[in-house]
């Protein structure tokens, strides 16, 4: 009788496992854009492509003005790569003349809006020096890290300098999420 | 790299069709949009109709019911027919694989790749 | 349709002149707009998107400026090379219309 009471355990019933090709997951990549104007102590936030090339949203994650959508709460990887380029001749001309509009560093930020809290909040964030490296060169800074995030999240991506983003070919630079 | 080979130029007597192709390499056609433009003499460039990358197409209002495109994905191969030509129908055409850009938060197209050119004389 | 006017149909100019080409859409196209540069015999060239944006590669001495209807392209100090027909498009809807074009020959 005794090992009756164990019988019940061989019964349990276990949720199905959820096929991966069902989650929530997104891939953007780098698409041409012109600097617009933000705000002097804010981040412009690049927008992406969504549906050519390598690109791609499924199973109910979207991508609208900037922003990827999270579709259900649960553990998400976030990830983003952003590839600079520029010409160290500008260094030079920053040190001399104290240009503000030329940087000595490049940052990336992966940024998360929620609709009911009033601040962006900062999940990841890169930042190099650019004025040591060669003549015409070339960096780039890959975030990614896991998180918890609700339905209704946003995500994006903010950079120092659009301008210096290369955008030459969608293996450079790009953003994508997916629930694990 | 992204290339766009075409057909060679092409000799049809008015009333006849023309069907050129345009054989792309460094992407698929499933997954980027394929337009066509046309140069004719005098003319500058004219924007004839896409094959977007899900099969669908849009074409100009002016060739509608005289071009068609098409395109086999197993050759990466996109098609443009032109029927009924008539001599104002010669011209250069070209493929080209269009971009999109944002300014602010609206996109647009152009048009950064394109083929080299395909001749249609069209002559009796 | 939107309409895009071109002007002049042609210019002549010397290597180092200073050119300026006009493009006017018949509506707003809200900076939707490229140039494109076509020699004869050769597939066009982009230039310039978003009425001022320098796609990769092209020298610095081509500049576009405008909105609304009205767009220019510069290029700041002519080049042999530069001898060519320049094309607008808008990029806003089909038919994604071409401007009919300003040859820039050599004076």
């Known amino acids: 009788l005794k090992g009756q009471e164990f019988a019940p355990s061989h019964q349990q019933v276990y949720a199905p496992l959820r096929a991966d090709g069902d989650k929530p997951r997104a891939h953007l990549t780098v698409v041409r854009q012109t600097p617009t104007q933000h705000f002097k102590n804010q981040f412009p936030a690049l927008h992406w492509e969504h549906e050519l090339g390598l690109a791609f949203t499924k199973n109910r994650m979207n991508y609208t003005n900037k922003f990827l959508l999270i579709p259900e709460s649960g553990d998400y990887f976030i990830y983003s790569q952003v590839t600079f380029r520029g010409m160290t001749s500008e260094c030079s001309e920053i040190r001399q003349a104290g240009r503000p509009n030329k940087p000595d560093s490049i940052t990336v930020v992966i940024t998360k809006v929620t609709d009911s809290y009033p601040e962006p909040t900062q999940l990841l964030m890169g930042t190099k020096s650019v004025c040591e490296v060669g003549s015409n060169w070339f960096q780039p800074i890959y975030l990614g890290a896991m998180f918890s995030l609700q339905e209704g999240d946003k995500l994006m991506v903010n950079v120092s300098d659009i301008s210096l983003v290369d955008y030459t070919k969608e293996d450079k630079t790009f953003f994508g999420a997916f629930l694990l | 790299q992204v290339q766009l080979v075409q057909s060679g130029a092409e000799v049809k007597k008015p009333g006849a069709s023309v069907k050129v192709s345009c054989k792309v390499s460094?992407?698929?056609?499933?997954?980027?949009?394929v337009h066509w433009v046309r140069e004719a003499p005098g003319q500058g460039l004219e924007w004839m109709g896409v094959?977007?990358?899900?099969?669908?197409?849009d074409y100009n209002s002016k060739f509608q019911g005289r071009v068609t495109m098409t395109r086999d994905t197993s050759t990466n191969t996109v098609y443009m027919e032109l029927s009924s030509l008539r001599s104002e129908d010669t011209a250069v055409y070209y493929c080209?694989?269009?971009?999109?850009?944002?300014?602010?938060?609206?996109?647009?197209?152009?048009?950064?790749?394109w083929g080299q050119g395909t001749l249609v004389t069209v002559s009796s | 349709d939107i309409q895009m006017t071109q002007s002049p149909s042609s210019v002549s100019a010397s290597v180092g002149d200073r050119v300026t080409i006009t493009c006017r859409a018949s509506?707003?196209?809200?900076?939707?707009l490229a140039w494109y540069q076509k020699k004869p015999g050769k597939s066009p060239k982009l230039l310039i998107y978003?009425?001022?944006s320098l796609q990769d590669g092209v020298p610095s001495r081509f500049s576009g400026s405008g909105s609304g209807t009205d767009y220019t392209l510069t290029i700041s100090s002519l080049q042999p090379e530069d001898f060519a027909t320049y094309f607008c498009?808008?990029?806003?809807?089909?038919?994604?219309?071409f401007g009919q074009g300003t040859k820039l020959e050599i004076k």
């Open positions: 080209a694989r269009a971009g999109r850009y944002y300014v602010d938060s609206n996109y647009y197209w152009d048009f950064p790749y």
């Open positions: 460094g992407f698929s056609v499933t997954r980027y949009n």
């Open positions: 094959m977007w990358s899900g099969a669908n197409t």
């Open positions: 509506e707003d196209i809200y900076s939707g």
């Open positions: 978003g009425a001022s």
């Open positions: 498009q808008e990029g806003l809807k089909s038919p994604y219309t």
